[in-house]
């Protein structure tokens, strides 16, 4: 098939308040060249959750776990989850440019938050 795939294997993730949530994303190619970013929600009002190159995201860490040749891991962990973090998270590949343009999005992972 044409070009790359953005794979979010988990349709949903449930996490207890105060714990960390791991949101998995693998990408099958670096080409076209450009960054990966994470968002909560879709459309123009979506919220940027993590951008590797710029910004301050103190609750987010990267958690690359894959050693497979066929894809690369762009998963993240969000610490100290609260009910306000509930929503659908998207791993999005951008194509490098001026400005960068959205190339392909994962299907999304719905995060739900359980009481402690």
């Amino acid at each position: 098939e044409e070009e790359l795939q953005v794979i979010q294997p988990d349709k949903s993730v449930s996490v207890a308040a105060g714990e960390s949530a791991i949101l998995h994303c693998t990408v099958t190619s670096l080409i076209p060249v450009g960054p990966i970013q994470w968002f909560r929600g879709a459309g123009p009002a979506r919220e940027l959750i993590y951008n590797q190159k710029e910004g301050h995201f103190p609750r987010v860490t990267t958690v690359s776990e894959s050693t497979k040749r066929e894809n690369m891991d762009f998963s993240i962990s969000i610490s100290n989850i609260t009910p306000a973090d509930a929503g659908t998270y998207y791993c999005v590949k951008f194509r490098k440019g001026s400005p960068d343009t959205e190339f392909k999005s994962g299907a999304g992972t719905e995060l739900s938050v359980r009481a402690k």
Partner: antibody
Amino acid sequence: EVQLVESGGGLVKPGGSLRLSCAASGFTFSSYVMSWVRQTPGKGLEWVATISSGGTYTYYPDSVKGRFTLSRDNAKNSLYLQMNSLRAEDTAVYYCASQLTGSEFDYWGQGTTVTVSS
Amino acid sequence: DIVITQSPASLAVSLGERATISCRASESVDSYGNSFMHWYQQKPGQPPKLLIYRASNLESGVPDRFSGSGSRTDFTLTINPLQAEDVATYYCHQSGDLPWTFGGGTKVEIK
């Protein structure tokens, strides 16, 4: 068994043109990013060009941008590098290489030699 | 451009001993915890062959006496124990950012 076989190298005068070809077999060519890498005794290994699996996106270093054009024919499992306005510094062994993820070069051909000299 | 400084340029090691090669990038080649530095072996008259991908992952079919480590800007290839068939030139390569670049190579010989 994966095979990448380059052809089209030779002796050409400065300012001239050459078209290199790479015939691929033993893997799903249309799923792979493909590249050319060249090697000279003086400069070592140098990345020359890359094309996405579907052929939509191409990338070149400044040293060849505007002079070299990379294309592919997935129906023929073939990769092509059109080299124009050749310079003496383009003299090298040119390798065709595959990249499953567009990252590391997983398979390399045996290379074809390009000599640019008057 | 990311410049890769590979050292040493040549290395003589006794059979059965450890060979260590270093590559330092002028800026980080990491993204999301992936280190986009790779290692290749080239024997005379042959093309390069992938040994290690993404800093520390052994390519299928490569003997486990080869190992890679490092992150961000500093990376190491280790051969332990060195065998006669490991005589070759070794190159590192970064694909963290365009233009992709290579180290200058390390020629490994038997002492």
